[in-house]
Each structure stands twice: as C-alpha cells, then as structure tokens.
C-alpha cells in the first residue's frame, strides 16, 4: 500500500503503527521527539521498501538501530529534500548503528548524521555504493571511530563474510552492523541492481529485485512505476506523479488537497500531475486541469476580507507576496523598519492593480513609493471620504513618488490628496497629475503648495561631469563647480556610488529613512581654489565592474520664492578596468594511463574581466623521501577512551604528545597554529551547523494544539 503524503511520527512511539501496511511512503518520514525511552523490538515494518522524499530521525530515545524497524527499506528517492539531505539522523541519543542493511540507493540528496553520541558503524559503510556523490555528506559529532571498535561479520573468527572497498585510501570490509554486511552487486551488473543471489536485475530496477532481468520483479523503479511494471517513461495518457509513478487523468483529477490552492485541484503540465501550474504558467480557465504560459508575471488575485489591508510592517506586507491584483484598499503606514524599501518591494513589487484606494500616511520610513514598482492602475472603485482614491498625508521623509520617466500609472476614478509631506516637491505631485490622468479633478486645497516640499531642494540645477578616469579598482571623476546665486550657500558635495550590473538604477533604489541605503556615500569638500573643479577618487572597487555614480550639492536651506535651490547630476555608469582573475577553483588531476594526466577545474570565482584562455603548467616532481622513512607497521598509541557527548568541537588529546621528526631533530612537537584560512573554514563550518540546526528546529517544532 502507498502511504502519504509524508508521515510525521512524534511524541508517542505507538504512532509507528501507522506504518504497518505501507510498502511505499509517498513523501517524507519523520520520526522525532520521542523523549521516553521505549522498547522498539515489537515494532517491525518489513513491508516498507521505498520512501520517495527523505527520512528524518531526531531525538528518539531508546532506539538503538533502524535495522529492526525497517529491515527492507531499499530506496530513499530524495524527490524532495530536507535542507539538501535525503537522510538526516540528528541527536539520536541511543542509536548504536544505522543498520539499514537493505538500503541500496539514495537517488538524490546527501546524508547528514550529526551529534549522535553513541552511534558507531559509520566508517564501515561505503556510502558511494548508495549515493552518486559523497562529497556533500556531513557525518560529524558521532562516537569517535577509535572508541567504536567496529567489527564486520566474521572478522573476529578470521572468516570475514563482507566485501572490501576503498574509502579515503583505506581498503576495508563494509558492513552495517556486527552481523550484517553491506550488499554489493557483481561488477558484471555495472550500474544495475542485483538479487540476493547476485543475479543482475532488469535495467529499470533500482535497489534490488526478486528475479533477474524482469521489469515486474523490481523492489523499486529507476524511473517510473506503472501497473506493476518499471518503465523508463510514463506511457501515453498517463502522467508522472511525485517523481516515481505514472497515473491517469482520472486519478489526477481526483486528488484532494488540504492546501491553500485546493479549490481548483491538481493540474497536468508537461507530462506531470502536479498541485499547481509551475512558475510562469496559469490554469487555462478556473476549472481547467491544464496550464498555459502567462504573459508577463502570472496574475494572482488577493482579497482582503475587511476590504482595507493595512501595511504597517514587513510581516503584513508578506501576505501580499506574489499578488498582482489587489481587491480592496491599501493603507500604508510604515513608521519604522529595517531595510524596509527592499523588503516592501520583495513582497509588494508585483502588484499591478488596486481596485479601491491607496492611502499613505505617517509613513516616516519611506523615501519613495518605488517599491510598488509594477503598480499601473488604481481603479478607485471604493474611495475615501471626499472622493479620494490616492491620499498622501504626513510622510516626513517622502521625496519621490515614482520615476515618472519609466512609469505609467492610471487612476481611473477619484481624486488625489497631498498634505504635510515636507520633502516631497510639488513639481513631483504635478507630474503625477499629468501621468495618472487626474489633472483637473483636484480642487485647490487637495494639493497643498505650502506644506509639501517645504524642506526640500525643489529647484534643482544639473551638475555636469567633466572627466572620468578608471583603473582596475579606482575611478576618478570631476564635475563642474556649482555656483548658486549666493556662493556661501554651497557647503559641500556628496558622491553616491554603487555596483550596477544594468543601467536601470534610480536614486531611491533600496533607500529608506531608517538608514538603509543601497548607495555608498562619500562627502567631498569644496576645493579651496575657486578655479579647481571638485572631484573624487573612489577606491577599493572591484575590477571589471560597472558602477553607477551621481553627485549632489549640499546647500543651505536657502529660500527663494518659497523654494530651495539645489543641484545634482544625472546618474553616470562607468566600468572599472579588467584585472588578473582569481585562481581557478577545484583543480583535480587524475592519471588514466602511465603517460597521461587528466586535469579538470572550475572557472575562477572572480574573473575580473572576460576570460579568454587558461594556462596549464606542469613539472615532474622528485619522489618524496619521507615516504620511506616512516614505519607503516607501527601503530600510534591508542588514545584514552572518552565517551562522546555528541558535541563536535572537542580535540582528542593523548597523555603524551606524539614524537615526530621536527625541525631536523627528534623531540616532542606542538601542533602548528591554525592558519587564517583554517580558522575561517572552522568559523564557516560552525555557522553552517547553526543554520542547519535552526532550519531543523523551525521545520519540526510546531505549537501544541490548544
């Protein structure tokens, strides 16, 4: 029987009974948070052979081996992973061995076995026989191998029963427990699975089979399962489902969901039965089971029960993620926040249509409304008292509405109202009237010319750049000296610059009034000599990188006809020169014959220009004499036995330091101090562990039902 869609067994070990008749778990299996040590010997699930997603074990007291629970678990497909892992064994306090002696294949994903204080038989398993790549496996903080004394079956009697393979240059027997070898198929089978009697399975089988060369006798399928047969692709009129089986249209239509999109059922797209159309596609009609490509971003209608959605934090904005049409009214009231502009753009940037009104008030954290970067239509179906559909009141730092050169916004019905926005120039409001088609709708008091823009440089002159010079990590720029009517009003200049891969940045990108700003800022004093043009050397830049730069004059708030004069430049795009690339990454060399070396590498992380070719140099090395000096028959002193507590940052210390050849003399040597690179790697490793642990806790801890 197929069980699913993922099974979560927690708190009570008796819930394991849910696995009784399962042959395939379509989804994940979680066994976790069972704090009372129980006797699991009476629980055995020999029917379970396949888990299509991942297996997660976390804090299950009393469980010593998985072999008795899942004696026939053969394949973990990893169709969906837990933080890149298909098998996670974490903080299993009593687990002594994994024991999954029939586990033959983890199709996708790596394994993470961490902080299991009593867990042995880890170095005796050759994971490369089970996984395609072992480089991402993370096996850390378990019982030290030297304390385990792992012995494979028959080793003590000097009649070893298991086969040997090489791991990390160590040729050894491979087993899961003291009495279970790790199964290996004859080399004649190649990548194919084999029976218990070492006969090769059908190429479409995965893991194992009950009869050789028979696609109906597979324990699991390499590709897809359909009507008792393993097939390379789903037959006509059937569709891939959950990455492992083929289902017909009727089956797909009859899947019931309890997730947010359940009202429309599953869809068939690109030969697959799936919960929703993939990114960039939309249903071809509300009752359709088929998807068609969207023109532009896919429409997503969001509705607010109470008609008006208040955006007063990032959390409230989060509810609008992906929405393109908002049915209702938007009330924006952002008084403070961290990195607010980019967060709002992330969650509200796709909104194109608001059916009601938009009201922005007391939003002192906002400098611009450009976070609503796709808003093109305010219908004004519902309006504020006084027939306003766009209302902007008391926003102390609002300087820009939108970049009107690249913005088309229509307000279909209703008027606009602006008051007490001291940094918002009236010219900006008048420009909005023209663009939105509301010119003539507003009465005299709707746009207050006295208290909008009273603290801004609304009459701006243009500063012109006069020269630019670049090197690999520097830019020198100069600009015309700005001369306001009264030269004493000019205080200094501020240069703004940032990396800009594309020529599409605006002054207000990522900027809010709470200190977040995607631009770097440098103050430039006036040159004492009136004939010298002001300029700056920007240094510490990246080679072969395009930067956007603009300059603003810092002036006294000098009022002339109720307006403050200021000056700023257009945005200039300028690229630094190319430089030497960083070193190529992951250089690997291997010999495939007595006269050839194959060398592979990845491109440098910092090309610093357009790479045109690589230079490969090699030279013959003399044999290392040290190899002959060491006595390989001598065993190092066995360290003092120490119980592993599941922590990681413990260095094993023996009573006497090892005596090695050191500095030309024999004598005790201290370990070399760690290099900066090693320290950095350790720091990153610790950080990565924390990130995983947080992910684990956030994923599995849920509030207790009320």
């Amino acid at each position: 029987e197929i069980c699913g869609p993922g099974i979560d067994i927690r708190n009570d070990y008796q819930q394991l009974k849910r696995l009784e008749n399962c042959t395939v778990i379509e989804g994940y299996l979680h066994i976790l948070l069972i704090s009372k040590a129980e006797d699991y010997r009476s629980y055995r699930f020999p029917k379970l052979t396949v888990i299509t997603e991942y297996l997660l074990l976390f804090r299950v007291a009393g469980l010593e081996s998985l072999g008795d629970l899942f004696p026939n678990l053969t394949v973990i497909r990893g169709w969906k992973l837990f933080y890149n892992y298909a098998l996670v064994i974490f903080e299993m306090t009593n687990l002594k061995d994994i024991g999954l002696y029939n586990l033959r294949n983890i199709t996708r994903g790596a394994i993470r076995i961490e902080k299991n204080a009593d867990l042995c038989y880890l170095s005796t398993v050759d994971w490369s026989l089970i996984l395609d790549a072992v480089s991402n496996n993370y096996i850390v903080g378990n019982k030290p191998p030297k304390e385990c004394g792992d012995l494979c079956p028959g080793t003590m009697e000097e009649k070893p029963m298991c086969e040997k393979t090489t791991i990390n240059n160590e040729y050894n027997y491979r087993c899961w427990t003291t009495n279970r070898c790790q199964k290996m198929c004859p080399s004649t089978c190649g990548k194919r699975a084999c029976t218990e009697n070492n006969e090769c399975c059908h190429p479409e089988c995965l893991g194992s089979c009950s009869a050789p060369d028979n696609d109906t006798a597979c324990v699991a399928c390499r590709h897809y399962y359909y009507a008792g047969v393993c097939v390379p692709a789903c037959p006509p009129n059937t569709y891939r489902f959950e990455g492992w089986r083929c289902v017909d249209r009727d089956f797909c239509a009859n899947i019931l969901s309890a997730e947010s999109s359940d009202s429309e059922g599953f869809v068939i797209h690109d030969g697959e039965c799936m919960q929703e159309c993939p990114s960039g596609f939309i249903r071809n009609g509300s009752q359709s089971m088929y998807c068609i490509p969207c023109e532009g971003p896919c429409p997503k209608v969001c509705e607010e029960e109470k008609k008006t959605k208040t955006i007063d934090s990032v959390t409230s904005a989060q509810m609008l993620q992906g929405c393109t049409i908002f049915k209702g009214n938007l009330l924006i009231n952002i008084r403070r926040g961290n990195n607010i502009a980019s967060e709002l753009e992330n969650f509200m940037g796709l909104i194109e249509v608001v059916t009601g009104y938009v009201k922005i008030r007391h939003s002192h954290a906002l400098v611009s409304l450009s976070f609503l970067k796709n808003l093109r239509l305010i219908l004004g179906e519902e309006q504020l008292e006084g027939n306003y559909s766009f209302y902007v009141l008391d926003n102390q730092n609002l300087q820009q509405l939108w970049d009107w050169d690249h913005r088309n916004l229509t307000i279909k019905a209703g008027k606009m109202y602006f008051a007490f926005n001291p940094k918002l120039c009236v010219s900006e409001i008048y420009r909005m009237e023209e663009v939105t088609g509301t010119k003539g709708r507003q009465s005299k008091g709707d746009i207050n010319t006295r208290n909008n823009g009273e603290r801004a440089s609304c009459e701006s002159d243009v500063l012109h750049f006069t020269s630019t010079t670049t090197s690999k990590n520097r830019i020198i720029i100069t600009w015309h000296r700005y001369r306001p009517p009264d030269y004493r009003d000019l205080i200094s200049f501020t240069v703004y610059y940032k990396e800009a891969p594309f020529k599409n940045v605006t002054e207000y990108d990522g900027q809010d009034a709470c200190g977040s700003n995607s631009w770097n800022m440098v103050d430039v004093d006036l040159p004492p000599n009136k004939d010298v043009e002001p300029g700056i050397l920007l240094h510490g830049l990246k080679p072969w990188t395009q930067y956007a730069v603009y300059v603003k004059a810092v002036t006294l708030t000098m009022v002339e006809n109720d307006h403050i004069r200021g000056a700023k430049s257009e945005i200039l795009y300028i690229r630094t020169n190319a430089s030497v690339p960083s070193i190529p990454l992951d250089v690997l060399s291997a010999s495939n014959s007595s006269s050839q070396l194959i060398v592979k590498w990845n491109p440098p992380s910092l090309p610093n220009g357009n790479l045109s070719y690589y230079i490969v140099r090699w030279q013959r090395q003399p044999q290392d004499g040290y190899l002959y000096r060491h006595n390989y028959c001598s065993k190092d002193k066995i360290p003092i036995r120490k119980y592993a507590d599941g922590t990681i940052d413990i260095e094993e210390v023996t009573e006497n330091p090892k005596t090695e050849v050191c500095g030309g003399e024999k004598g005790p040597c201290c370990a070399c101090p760690k290099t900066e690179a090693e320290k950095q790697a350790e720091k990153e490793e610790a950080e990565y562990r924390k990130v995983f642990e947080n992910f684990l806790h956030n994923s599995i801890f849920v509030p207790r039902p009320e």
Epitope: E1, V247, S257, A258
Partner: nanobody
Framework: EVQLVESGGGLVQPGGSLRLSCAAS????????MSWFRQAPGKEREFVSA????????RYADSVKGRFTISRDNSKNTLYLQMNSLRAEDTAVYYC????????????????WGQGTLVTVSS
C-alpha cells in the same frame, strides 16, 4: 492529540436517510483532507467519500454516487455524511478519517481514524 468521534449511526429502513457527523479535535481542521470509510461484517474496509480542506471539492465511491453527500464545517471542526436512499448493502460500521495536506484516490492508510459508528439498514 488528534481525536475523531463519529455519531449519528443507527437503524433505518431501506430508502430512508441518515446524517453522520464526525467531530474533530485538531488545531487546523482545514489542513486535513477528511474521508468516510466503511466496513461491512466480514468484509474489507472500503472507501466511501472524501472532501478537500476547504470543502470545495469531493469524490465518492461509485456505489454511493448520487445518494450520499459529504460536507464539512471548518468553523465547527465537523465532517458530515448525508446518506439518502439507503440500501441493505450500506449496512456497515462507518469510520471518519483525516489525512494531512492531501489524499490520492489510492491512499487508504489515513493518519487518523475514529472509532466508528454503526449504520444498519433493515426493514
């Protein structure tokens, strides 16, 4: 602890009607697909009907199509089965079952089960 408690069973004449209820104690009732199964004496448990989390979609076994209606009230954490035109072969213990996230037509191993309520159709 998730609990499902069925009620509404009893003796009814052929052609009659009954309404079964299933009261669920779970934090987010709407995130479970709910189903009715039944088991007649000496027979295997069989699927009767299921309903999606929001209640907008449902499916039925061929033997009950047109006669039975499944519904749910998420505000009351309750599942219902309205049974009309009852026949003698509908006699069985009716079980309410819940599965998180989704249920395919071939899932019979639901996560949570009630104790059952007996429906007897006899003249």
């Amino acid at each position: 602890e998730v609990q499902l408690v069925e009620s509404g069973g009893g003796l009814v004449q052929p052609g009659g009607s009954l309404r079964l209820s299933c009261a669920a104690s779970m934090p987010t009732f709407s995130s479970f697909v709910m189903s009715w199964f039944r088991q007649a004496p000496g027979k295997e448990r069989e699927f009767v009907s299921a309903i999606s989390g929001s209640g907008s979609r449902s499916r039925y076994a061929d033997s009950v199509k047109g006669r039975f209606t499944i519904s749910r009230d998420n505000s009351k954490n309750t599942l219902y089965l309205q049974m009309n035109s009852l026949r003698a072969e509908d006699t069985a213990v009716y079980y309410c079952a819940a599965n998180p996230r989704r249920a395919t037509p071939d899932y019979t191993q639901y996560a949570y089960w009630g104790q059952g309520t007996l429906v007897t159709v006899s003249s």
